[in-house]
């Protein structure tokens, strides 16, 4: 297993609709490779997998239909979008990139993006 550098933004603020987007960039030493991107959430020293996708470098990446993540890829960059976030989902979201095949296998883990989610204030009832 060889190490690979992965870069991602330090902080992202989710939109009022609970959507957060960030770029995960990896320094790939190989050519066309099967790549696996995993988003991990770290909160209170617990790490859980949010979503994962495997794709061919240069092609689109597809998450499972029921995934809360969507994304596009361009070269060595993956543009990730996480939806349906609520205040309780605030935490550190880590991008993990694996160059799966062919060997050599490379693994890179970013420092994480702190995503802040603020639940929108409920709209006050109004008389028309």
């Amino acid at each position: 297993c060889k190490a690979m550098h992965v870069a991602q933004p330090a902080v992202v603020l989710a939109s009022s609709r609970g959507i957060a987007s960030f770029v995960c960039e990896y320094a790939s030493p190989g050519k066309a490779t099967e790549v696996r991107v995993t988003v991990l959430r770290q909160a209170d020293s617990q790490v859980t997998e949010v979503c994962a996708a495997t794709y061919m470098m240069g092609n689109e990446l597809t998450f499972l239909d029921d995934s809360i993540c969507t994304g596009t890829s361009s070269g060595n960059q993956v543009n990730l979008t996480i939806q349906g976030l609520r205040a309780m989902d605030t935490g550190l979201y880590i991008c993990k990139v694996e160059l799966m095949y062919p060997p050599p296998y490379y693994l890179g883990i970013g420092n994480g993006t702190q995503i802040y989610v603020i639940d929108p204030e409920p709209c006050p009832d109004s008389d028309f």
Epitope: A32, T54, P102, P103
Partner: antibody, heavy 119, light 111 residues
């Protein structure tokens, strides 16, 4: 013990296509990558490409790009190699072989399929 | 893609040893411990004899051993037997080509 069994010999006309099958038994089809290698008469081994049976993703040797297609049918644990625009120098024995993701070993190998291209 | 370089032939008397070399570059043989060796008898499929430079699959006699120094890998067959007469190929992944490369092949003759 995993076994790979390939389809029988083929005789093809120049310009046509050939499709070879490689059926896996005795183990999980989707956990290891399938590679294809060919050997022309009296020549050495030549790697053609790989396929991930789990995702269907493929990678090809540069010289075969555009002429080779690797596919699979996971329901019958079978991988396929299709080679198009056949020429006489494509006459060879074609082998499939299994490769764990983080290893350089090809094991086991199919018994081979002889493809003869002749008019 | 360019093949790894092997001597075309090697020979030895029964009971003696023979060593086959496989020379590549830092992108393949020298860069990773992925070198495998395959034995091929006429009309048969290749058989894995050594993988990851030194490892032997179960069922392969311990007369077969592998090693590596720099960009050159070697296969040694000690205590040669008649059934060891075959073609031997090295193979490894090439990190710059993202391809598997084989050696040119060595015909081993037991005298």
């Amino acid at each position: 013990q995993m076994q790979l069994v390939q389809s029988g010999a083929e005789v093809k006309m120049p310009g046509s296509s050939v499709r070879i099958s490689c059926k896996a038994s005795g183990g999980s089809f989707t956990t290891h990558f399938i590679n294809w290698v060919r050997q022309a008469p009296g020549q050495g081994l030549e790697w053609m490409g790989w396929m991930n049976p789990n995702t269907g993703n493929t990678g090809y040797a540069e010289r075969f790009q555009g002429r080779v297609t690797l596919t699979r049918d996971t329901s019958i644990s079978t991988a396929y190699l299709e080679l198009s625009s056949l020429r006489s120098d494509d006459t060879a024995v074609y082998y499939c072989a299994r490769n764990p993701a983080e290893s350089g070993r090809f094991d086991p190998w199919g018994q081979g399929t002889l493809v003869t291209v002749s008019s | 893609q360019s093949a790894l370089t092997q001597p075309p032939s090697a020979s030895g008397s029964p009971g003696r040893s023979v060593t086959i070399s496989c020379t590549g570059t830092s992108n393949n043989v020298g860069g990773y411990n992925y070198v495998s060796w395959y034995q091929q008898h006429p009309g048969k499929a290749p058989k894995l004899m050594i993988y990851e430079v030194t490892k032997r699959p179960s069922g392969v006699p311990d007369r077969f051993s592998g090693s590596k120094s720099g960009n050159t890998a070697s296969l040694t067959v000690s205590g040669l037997q008649a059934e060891d007469e075959a073609d031997y190929y090295c193979g490894t992944w090439d990190g710059s080509l993202n391809a598997y490369v084989f050696g040119t092949g060595t015909k081993v003759t037991v005298l």
